[in-house]
């Protein structure tokens, strides 16, 4: 190889070793005979060499700086060469580098032909291998502005005081041209602008000037946005940082053309403008930082731009001034991510405040609007609490559990409505009342409603999950000892049609001590599947769960079992199992640690099946599966 | 994996000549010098002179110049010192090297006695 | 001829703590940018082995404990945590200018 570098070119060359390979074999420049790991060659300078082994890109890179003096004599503004030509190099993985070094007062623009920048973030690459690392100066500061890839958004980047851009090839890419021109511009004022061009939908992701590190104190940065006037664009942030300001106050501004109050102020922490039409610009303002802890401000952002949907110019309100203790949470469905450009699906608070998840509290009126190509990417979660702290004042009193019809009218599905209530420990226990009678969730009898009410426990400490109901069973009322969240989870879309068999109340009624009671009135028709509560994980120690199981005069109940032991291993304690005719009190007692349990019986009157747990070891739980069914009384045995 | 192997070691009457080599296997035995090195018991190491193969061109440290001839044979990537004139004071261990000395030798114990 | 001069010519050093070992030529070794001092160890009854390759290139295969640093006439090969396989004599060379020339050594033993 030769490189003959023209004199007055200020240009250097260092062919140096890159980042250290496994690999045992070394590899040198022979230069005279002589074997070295580095060649620096300088203006005016001609050097011919050799490298001792066959993939000498395996082991050395070369850097090509180009220095550029703006502050002697004029500018070469125009479009960059890349000198020398990539065919006179040796091919080993190659980074151009020009600095440009200029006054205060000129601003230098930096312009990206087709096709455009996009920036990454820490850690990324870029899938060519082709990277442009960007860098300005304050003072004698060097500042990164950022690292890109090619296929982006970036059209210009305008800065003052020098430019330093470096363009990595890998040693394998053809490419031949810098990709970008210099010109000159006023000073600008400010650390940079970058301009983003969207030519139709896409999205941007964009950072502060040193991320991940601190963006300089009290400067200023920013980002114009280049958007066609039908599509709309929309800023989140992904990531940031707050310092610790001295004075003045560390915010974004947004230029947006058509509104009254440019600028519009912003502080970092907000939700940032969304559905805005046509070009903006975003700027990030430093402020004066503690000196002794000036912690860091830094900022990762998106703008996603789009086309307006229908729902976008829609306004739905969502009156929750009657409410108390409630909360509603509009999100993003969990999706599989995919690779191609997905429209941003955001929810918008007086069409402006847009995000990809909002929360409404109850006491206020809301207005909501979509911006969002799918709905069905959303769905709706809600909270609302109903407690009693006296104990007289809510002794029979009953709730309704329905789905206010607001909520149901939104273009959103319904994913949960979760009730939390809450009773005075030991003093009050609840019972809750379907509209239409219920069918635990079982693997041998799924539900296949549209929808399910989930019981559990609510008391923290309590790991109590009772299951799964929907409506079309046997089961007619369950009551619970202490604190439950009942949810209701929606299935399918078809809910709304279905909303109408939702329908649960709830009572405050004396303290019992058993942790559940079932109600049970079998129909003729079915088999009945009831199971123990949390199943899979065991009925929780100590706990002693009833089912009241109704059979009609006409009627013989069969109560099955579908195993022949319980698996029940107690470390303190016993587990027992009671069958108890209502009419004359007899009662079975099976140890469900030791006995196996009882066959197939028939019962021609109402009877409880009571089941309570020892403390089990570990593994060895107490999870129970059976049936009841009815059948008609040949005999009359009365 | 390059492995340099010396020839075994010689017993030589004072006056004589010995011809040591050095054969190179796994490498591009013309790029690189080769350097021999004389290590005298309970010694340090001393540089006598190196070969680059490729155009036969040879160094030697001025002690050796008379007493060490290097030459090189391409097709067989074999390198050779010829010591001459020997007395006791050349019984010593030596070492064939590559430079960069990333390989070595196991090397020649050359005895000189009458 | 360039003479390298070693110091300490013997060393004790206690096992986990550091070694350094210096080398003194007396012109400077440096051309094309690069320092054309090697180092390397011998145990007895071995072939001497490559450590440092010009001056601050660790050799494949050596543990990272070493470390080469210095230009022109000042040199240092540091050991860093010292292990009791590291009992050697330590030797300097330069190649930069003929004759080339090995430094006296360098003895370390391990406390």
């Known amino acids: 190889f030769e490189i003959a570098l023209p004199r007055e070119s200020n240009i250097t060359v260092l062919i140096k070793l890159g980042t250290p390979t496994l690999l045992a074999k070394p590899c040198y420049i022979v230069i005279s005979k002589r074997h070295i790991t580095m060649l620096s060659i300088k203006s005016g300078e001609r050097i011919v060499f050799t490298f001792s082994c066959q993939s000498p890109e395996n082991h050395f890179v070369i850097e090509i700086q180009k220095n550029i003096d703006c502050m002697s004599g004029p500018c070469p503004f125009g479009e960059v060469q890349l000198q020398p030509s990539t065919s006179l190099l040796p091919t080993l993985n190659r980074t151009f580098i020009w600095d440009v070094k200029a006054h205060k007062s000129i601003g230098l623009e930096l312009q990206f032909s087709i096709p455009r920048l996009r920036q990454i973030g820490p850690g990324e690459s870029c899938p060519d291998g082709v990277t442009h690392s960007i860098s300005g100066r304050i003072d004698a500061t060097v500042v990164r502005i950022g690292t890109f890839c090619s296929n982006g958004t970036v059209s210009r980047i305008k800065m003052q005081e020098g430019v330093k851009m470096a363009l990595h090839l890998p040693w394998f890419h053809p490419r031949n041209v810098s990709g970008f021109s210099i010109a000159n511009r006023s000073s600008i004022k400010r650390l940079c602008i970058i301009e983003s061009v969207f030519e139709g939908e896409g999205s941007a992701t964009l950072m502060s000037a040193n991320y991940p590190e601190g963006f300089p104190e009290d400067e200023l940065m920013t980002w114009q946005f280049v958007v066609p006037a039908h599509l709309r664009a929309s800023v989140s942030f992904l990531n940031f940082n707050l310092s610790n300001c001295e004075r003045k106050e560390e915010r974004v501004e947004y230029y947006i053309p058509g509104s009254t109050t440019n600028p519009e102020v912003f502080k970092l922490e907000d939700k940032q403008p969304g559905n805005m039409a046509g070009n903006f610009n975003l700027s990030l303002q430093g402020c004066d930082q503690d000196a002794q802890s000036p912690g860091i401000l830094r900022l990762q952002f998106q703008v996603l731009v789009q086309h307006p949907q229908n729902e976008s110019n829609k306004i739905y309100v969502v009156d929750l001034s009657n409410e108390r203790a409630m909360s509603l949470t509009i999100e993003p469905r969990p999706v599989k991510q995919s690779r191609k450009f997905v429209p941003g699906c955001f929810v918008c608070l007086e069409s402006r405040t847009c995000s990809s998840n909002l929360t409404l509290t109850s006491g206020s009126k809301h207005k909501i609007s979509f911006l969002c190509d799918d709905l069905t990417r959303l769905w709706m979660n809600v909270e609302k609490t109903i407690s009693c702290t006296d104990h007289r004042y809510c002794q029979r009193k009953s709730y309704s559990l329905q789905v206010p019809s607001d909520i149901l009218h939104l273009p959103v599905e319904l994913h949960d409505f979760s009730w939390k209530l809450l009773v005075p420990k030991d003093r009050l226990s609840l019972v809750l009342v379907p509209a239409q009678k219920l069918q635990q969730h079982t693997h041998e009898k799924p539900c296949n409603t549209s929808f399910s009410y989930l019981v559990a426990s609510a008391i923290p400490s309590q790991d109590l999950y009772f299951g799964s109901f929907c409506p079309g069973g046997s089961i007619k009322q369950i009551q619970v000892k202490q604190n439950i969240s009942v949810t209701l989870r929606t299935f399918a879309p078809s809910f709304q049609q279905e909303a109408s068999r939702q329908g649960l109340t709830v009572s405050f009624i004396p303290y019992f001590k058993e942790e559940g009671v079932f109600t049970v009135t079998p129909d003729t028709k079915s088999k009945v599947y009831l199971r123990t509560p949390n199943w899979d994980r065991g009925l929780p120690s100590l706990t002693s769960v009833s089912w009241n199981i109704s059979v009609p005069r006409d009627q013989v109940a069969c109560l099955t079992f579908f195993k022949e032991r319980s698996g029940v291993v107690c470390q303190t304690g016993r587990a027992f199992m009671i069958i108890q005719e209502q009419r004359t009190r007899a009662e079975e007692i099976f140890s469900l640690d030791e006995d196996v349990l009882p066959k197939p019986s028939f019962h021609h009157h109402s009877f409880w099946v009571n089941i309570s747990n020892c403390s089990p070891t570990s593994g060895k739980q107490l999870d129970l599966l059976f049936s009841v069914t009815l059948t008609p009384r040949t005999v009359d045995l009365t | 994996e390059v492995q340099l192997q010396e020839s075994g070691a010689e017993l030589a009457r004072p006056g004589a000549s010995v011809k040591l080599s050095c054969k190179a296997s796994?490498?591009?035995?013309?790029?690189?010098?080769m350097q021999w090195v004389k290590q005298r018991p309970g010694q340090g190491l001393e540089w006598i002179g190196a070969i680059y193969p490729g155009d036969g061109d040879t160094r030697y440290t001025q002690k050796f110049k008379g007493k060490a001839t290097l030459t090189a044979d391409k097709s067989s990537s074999t390198a050779y010192m010829q010591l001459s004139s020997l007395a006791s004071e050349d019984s010593a261990v030596y070492y064939c090297?590559?430079?960069?000395?990333?390989?070595w030798g196991q090397g020649t114990t050359l005895t000189v006695s009458s | 001829n360039i003479v390298l001069t070693q110091s300490p010519a013997s060393l004790a050093v206690s096992l986990g703590q550091r070694a350094t070992i210096s080398c003194r030529a007396s012109?400077?070794?440096?051309?094309?940018?690069?320092?054309?001092m090697h180092w390397y160890q011998q145990k007895p009854g071995q072939p001497p082995k490559l450590l440092i390759y010009?001056?601050?290139n660790l050799e494949s295969g050596v543990p990272a404990r070493f470390s080469g640093s210095g230009s022109r006439t000042d040199f240092t090969l540091t050991i860093d945590p010292v292990e009791a396989d590291d009992a050697a004599t330590y030797y300097c060379?330069?190649?930069?200018?003929?004759?080339?020339?090995f430094g006296g050594g360098t003895k370390l033993e391990i406390k």
């Open positions: 796994g490498n591009t035995f013309t790029n690189y010098w």
């Open positions: 060379q330069q190649n930069n200018e003929d004759p080339w020339t």
């Open positions: 090297t590559t430079s960069p000395a990333h390989y």
């Open positions: 010009l001056a601050s």
């Open positions: 012109e400077s070794v440096d051309s094309y940018g690069n320092s054309f």
